[in-house]
Each structure stands twice: as structure tokens, then as C-alpha cells.
Interface confidence: medium
């Protein structure tokens, strides 16, 4: 399991009308559902029910958008619609260029996602716990214009904010 | 001030080839998502290819894809459309287009446009 | 591919408010997100973003531009109309792919 390296690019407007980004470096891992891919886009947040409605026309973007979700508790959600692996396949035939779950309430969801798929996805599903997950969550939440990049290297230059 | 310069246009025969550079300046180029769009008066607006932040990632309309390959230079602020095998319906203006912040969804900044024409 | 499609002209007065409509061939609001947009363009100039996601002003336009609509149906207004305005308007959408409608020209009466 490959350490994936996530820039999350937070967008905020200034008085110029220009933006200032504030980038934010976390680490997650990629999962064996998916390919080990670098993979960029505009960050949707996914509820898991969301995720169960099998109408096309819930689809979101023709475009590589990435789909974060945040897992809830088993007991929560005692007989899911999809399992994890699903509700990935399920992110990515709407459209998502990788997926990246929040295992944090979940962390059974790392087995199954790593569990040997005969067909894993062609896009990155990537998943993170912990610090990483607070990151993450807490700039999705704002629901501002945020991005994220996801590389199977560390980004060159990691920086904490920069002015546009 | 957000600026966008097109150069490379000018006439072709069908079946050639032609290069367009878009120079950028006024804004981090390497934070926005390029994209050409072309305009022919017969045909009206039509958007050709879009390019991400990083490079790595393209979109293209279908009546181009396997003939145009767009690409960047960020340390050169510039955006290219390499168009080979050129046909007629081709001829039009080409636009370079600066996306929406975090979003490829709209086109923010436009150039002043190329004209390109493709004629034997 | 999504076909937008606006009429061709719009005849107003000046001070008076312009409706320009653009309908297209299936929805583009997916998820909350209205992926309708809207721009000018002045003869011999290229266009100019006006409206983002249906209603968002762009950047240093002038507030007497506003956008609505969702689904199918969208609208761009203008009011009032200056004389500066009296030009082309085009919707864009990028539900699938990105497209334009044809474009309305704003006509004085």
C-alpha cells in the first residue's frame, strides 16, 4: 500500500477579485481498489447514502472531479446499500477521477478496500484516518471552492499558503 | 491585469499542420485550469480543449480529439495547441481561455483570438 | 451534446429591463450545482464571463446583470439596459462537455 501525497487547494477571494489558495499537504494511502495514480479535480463531498441512489441523472460531473466521503460508524449503518468497494465503483461511474474516504470512524473499511479485487478501478481510491482526516474534513467543510491533487510522490514544493 | 496573448495563426491546407502559443501574464498561471475555444461565424462558440493546473490532465471535443494535443509550460506562463492534420472546417478564430479559480467549469479571461484558416 | 438554445434577437429600450432566455436540450443542474453560464461579446472582441453557475456575478461586472434558473430554463437580465449593452449575449453550459447556445443580440426599439 503506497503512500498517496494529497494537496488539498483551498480557494478564497480577495478584494482584487483574484484568490489567495491555501494549500494544505496531507498523506493518505492509496488502496488496492483502485490504481496508484496521480489525479486532480474539483473536490465534491459525498455522503455515503448519497452514494446508494443509483439514478443516472445523479450523476455530477462529465469532468474528474474527486469524491471525498466521510465513512460513518458500522453500527451507524448496519446493512449498507454497497459496500466501500462499491460505493468507490459507484463514485467513479459518476464521473469522480479518484475517490478519497475518510476511514477515521471506519477503519474496517481499510480491509475491504484492500482486499485483492480481480478487477480494481482505474482511478485512485484512496483513503486517510487520523490528523490527515481532521485536515481534510475541516476544508471540505467550509464548502468553498477547494481542489485536490493527488500524487504518488511528495509534491516538490510543499508550501502552507501562497498569494495569487 | 489578467492578460492572454495568441500568436501562430494564419492559412493552411487541409491535411497540414500549425501550432498556436497563448503567453499569459498578470495572474499564477500554474493555479488555473487553460482551455482553447474557437469561433467560426458559421458555427458559433464551440470549445476545443482544456488542460489542467499540472499538465497531466486534457479534455478534448470530439470532432478534434487525436488531431489537436494541447499542452503547457508553466515555468513559461504559455499554453499551445499543436492542430495537424487540419480540414476546412477547422477555419475559425481560436480563443485561449483562462477556467474558472478551482473549476473548469466557465472560461474567466479570454484572449484577443488567432485566426486560423484552413484552405487548399 | 447538450444543445443550448437562445433567440436570436432581444428588441429593448433603454432603462427598461432585457430578459435574455437560453433553454437547453436536458438539465444541467446536477447535485445543487446550476452548470449554466453566460457571457457578452462586443462586435470584433471576445467574450466576456458575466455570470458563473447561473447566479454568481463575475468579477467587476456591474450589478445591474443577474442570472437565474435551474433544470432547463435559465435567464440572464439585464436592468437597466445602457447603451453599452446593446450587443451579443451567449449561454454556456458544462453539464456534458462544454457548449454554447447561439447567441442574442440585444436590439434597441
Known amino acids: 500500500k503506497e503512500t498517496a501525497f494529497v494537496e488539498v487547494v483551498l480557494f478564497e477571494s480577495s478584494p482584487s477579485g483574484d484568490y489567495t489558495t491555501y494549500t494544505t499537504g496531507l498523506t493518505g494511502r492509496f488502496s488496492r481498489a483502485g490504481a496508484t495514480l496521480s489525479a486532480e479535480g474539483e473536490i465534491v463531498q459525498m455522503h455515503p447514502l448519497g452514494l446508494c441512489n443509483n439514478n443516472d441523472e445523479e450523476d455530477l460531473y462529465e469532468y474528474g472531479w474527486v469524491g471525498v466521503v466521510k465513512l460513518e460508524q458500522p453500527e451507524l449503518d448496519p446493512k449498507p446499500c454497497l459496500t466501500v468497494l462499491g460505493k468507490a465503483k459507484r463514485a467513479v461511474q459518476r464521473g469522480a477521477t479518484a475517490v478519497i474516504f475518510d476511514v477515521s470512524e471506519n477503519p474496517e473499511a481499510i480491509d475491504q478496500l484492500n482486499q485483492g479485487s480481480e478487477d480494481p478501478l482505474k482511478r485512485p481510491v484512496v483513503y486517510v484516518k487520523g490528523a490527515d482526516a481532521i485536515k481534510l474534513m475541516n476544508i471540505v467543510n467550509k464548502q468553498k471552492v477547494a481542489r485536490a491533487r493527488i500524487q504518488h510522490r511528495p509534491p516538490r514544493q510543499p508550501t502552507e499558503y501562497f498569494d495569487m | 491585469e489578467v492578460q492572454l496573448a495568441e500568436s501562430g495563426g494564419g492559412l493552411e491546407q487541409p491535411g497540414r499542420s500549425l501550432k498556436l502559443s497563448c503567453a499569459a501574464s498578470?495572474?499564477?498561471?500554474?493555479?488555473?485550469?487553460m482551455a482553447w475555444v474557437r469561433q467560426a461565424p458559421t458555427r458559433g462558440l464551440e470549445w476545443v480543449a482544456s488542460?489542467?493546473?499540472?499538465?497531466?490532465?486534457?479534455y478534448y471535443r470530439d470532432s478534434v480529439k487525436g488531431r489537436f494535443t494541447v499542452s503547457r509550460d508553466n515555468a513559461k506562463s504559455t499554453l499551445y495547441l499543436q492542430m495537424d492534420s487540419l480540414r476546412s472546417e477547422d477555419t475559425a478564430t481560436y480563443y485561449c481561455?483562462?477556467?474558472?479559480?478551482?473549476?473548469?467549469?466557465?472560461?474567466?479571461?479570454w484572449g484577443q483570438g488567432t485566426l486560423v484558416t484552413v484552405s487548399s | 451534446d447538450i444543445v443550448l438554445t437562445q433567440s436570436p434577437a432581444l428588441a429593448v429600450s433603454l432603462g427598461q429591463r432585457a430578459t435574455i432566455s437560453c433553454r437547453a436540450s436536458?438539465?444541467?443542474?446536477?447535485?445543487?450545482?446550476?452548470?449554466m453560464h453566460w457571457y457578452q461579446q462586443k462586435p470584433g472582441q471576445q467574450p466576456k464571463l458575466l455570470i458563473y453557475?447561473?447566479?454568481n456575478l463575475a468579477f467587476g461586472i456591474p450589478a445591474r446583470f443577474s442570472g437565474s434558473g435551474s433544470g432547463t430554463d435559465f435567464t440572464l437580465t439585464i436592468n437597466p439596459v445602457q447603451a453599452d449593452d446593446i450587443t451579443t449575449y451567449y449561454c454556456?453550459?458544462?453539464?456534458?462537455?462544454?457548449?454554447f447556445g447561439g447567441g442574442t443580440r440585444l436590439e434597441l426599439k
Open positions: 453557475r447561473a447566479s
Open positions: 488542460i489542467l493546473t499540472s499538465g497531466g490532465t486534457t
Open positions: 481561455a483562462r477556467h474558472g479559480v478551482g473549476s473548469y467549469d466557465w472560461f474567466a479571461d
Open positions: 436536458q438539465s444541467v443542474t446536477i447535485s445543487g450545482y446550476n452548470l
Open positions: 498578470g495572474f499564477t498561471f500554474s493555479n488555473y485550469d
Open positions: 454556456q453550459q458544462s453539464r456534458k462537455s462544454r457548449t
